[in-house]
């Protein structure tokens, strides 16, 4: 033991954080300790590899400690990425470990769970579209758009609620196409054209 | 390396069941999905299910339910497949396959032959 | 269930050709597609996943397209290592099309 060794201490923990399936991400990790700490990532208990141990690898062990994923990898089954991860410091006096920080894939699939149908309602009755949006996460968020235009929902007759579009009292100058618009920080998904026919 | 490694050639006779096991190693065993398919000899593959090692949650064809229960013990990163009522025409290369991230089935074991005969 | 429908069931070809495989299915699967290569006695070999990215280490002659119902792979210039069977396979709820056997002409 010399004098001036010590064991790790983590000077930089990981943060949570949610990223788009496919786009870069790091975790941060920095240590501290003489001699210089190896830094190991852990997820679920489990050592996470990285191009260390395969040179293929979609995650690198960067010389700051910190684990950096060229992109990340989320399918419908497999999910290799996401979950719970710790750094892990060690030098011959000890080991230190950083905070838990979860890595959450955000992602927007494709296919409409319910596309909204064509309606047609009279003058002066109400009109109502639903849609189901594809599943994402975070959940998407519904809005809606008329003649590829966004709708108007200060119109005090137009009421959005879940996936459900409401029209009080329809006028002749609601008639058009509608298509519902799912959103999360992935982008934007639109279902299929539904078309609101007015009657007089 | 990455790689998957299927146990042995086996012989059964009709009725009887087989246990077919596939050793991974080089990757994170819980986060990818295990399928198993078999190709009968001269024909295609045909897709028999798939386990989530994370939860040991299983989904088979129709054609498979009743018939066929996969396993795995995440402390020795092994899948398994049990084939049970073996019949003649169960005679094929069962292959063990890691579903990607992305969707598709990147690493296969070398497969297990396994022949049903009286 | 989704059935996926591959054409043609066999073919044959020279060296130096442009060889296209179609794969459909009997209904919208977006683009989960994948295509293997498999050799006599070897396991499937991933070549394309999702309809038209290319595996690490596949040749780029090799290539692959399509959405929705009806998917393509074509070899630019078929080399001898490519005689082989190819099989499509949706990823959607997963399921192999019947294989084309390319064989030499």
């Known amino acids: 033991l010399r004098q001036e060794d010590f064991p790790p201490r983590i000077v930089e923990h990981p943060s949570d954080l949610i990223v788009s399936k496919g786009e870069p991400a790091t975790l941060n990790c920095k240590a501290e300790g003489r001699p210089t700490p190896t830094i190991e990532w852990y997820k679920g208990g489990e050592r996470v590899e990285t191009d260390k141990d395969d040179p293929r690898s979609h995650r690198m062990l960067l010389p700051s400690g910190s684990l950096f994923f060229l992109r990340i990898v989320h399918g419908r089954k497999s999910r290799p990425d996401e979950g719970v991860y710790v750094c892990v410091a060690r030098n011959y006096l000890g080991e230190a470990v950083s905070h838990n920080a979860s890595l959450e894939v955000a992602i927007l699939r494709d296919d409409f769970r319910q596309n909204p149908s064509d309606v047609m309602v009279a003058v002066g009755e109400p009109a109502v579209m639903e849609c189901q949006p594809p599943r994402g996460h975070p959940e998407p968020t519904i809005s809606w758009k008329k003649d590829g235009s966004p709708l108007d929902d200060k119109d005090e007759r137009i009421t959005i609620r879940g996936g459900k579009l409401m029209i009080t009292y329809t006028r002749k100058s609601d008639a058009g196409k509608y298509v519902c618009v799912g959103t999360n920080m992935v982008g934007e998904r639109e279902s299929e054209v539904a078309e609101l026919t007015v009657l007089e | 390396e990455v790689q998957l490694v299927q146990s042995g050639a086996e012989v059964k006779k009709p009725g009887a069941s087989v246990k077919v096991s596939c050793k991974a190693s080089g990757y994170t065993f819980r986060g990818y999905a295990m399928h198993w398919v078999r190709q009968a000899p001269g024909q295609g593959l045909e897709w028999m299910g798939w386990?989530?090692?994370?939860?040991?949650?299983?989904k088979f064809p129709q054609k498979f339910q009743g018939r066929v229960t996969m396993t795995r013990d995440t402390s020795i990163t092994t899948a398994y497949m049990d084939l049970s009522r073996l019949r003649s025409d169960d005679t094929a290369v069962y292959y063990c396959?890691?579903?990607?991230?992305?969707?598709?089935?990147?690493?296969w074991g070398q497969g297990t032959m396994v022949t049903v005969s009286s | 269930d989704i059935v996926m429908t591959q054409s043609p069931s066999s073919l044959s070809a020279s060296v130096g050709d442009r060889v296209t495989i179609t794969c459909r299915a009997s209904?919208?699967?977006?683009?989960?597609l994948n295509w293997y290569q498999q050799k006599p006695g070897k396991a499937p070999k991933l070549l394309i996943y999702a309809a038209s990215s290319l595996q690490y280490g596949v040749p780029s002659r090799f290539s692959g397209s399509g959405s929705g119902t009806d998917f393509t792979l074509t070899i630019s210039s078929l080399q001898p290592e490519d005689f082989a069977t190819y099989y499509c396979?949706?990823?959607?709820?997963?399921?192999f099309g019947g294989g084309t056997k390319v064989e030499i002409k």
């Open positions: 209904q919208k699967i977006s683009s989960y």
């Open positions: 396979q949706q990823s959607y709820s997963t399921s």
């Open positions: 396959a890691r579903e990607s991230g992305d969707d598709a089935f990147d690493i």
């Open positions: 386990i989530d090692p994370r939860t040991g949650l299983t």
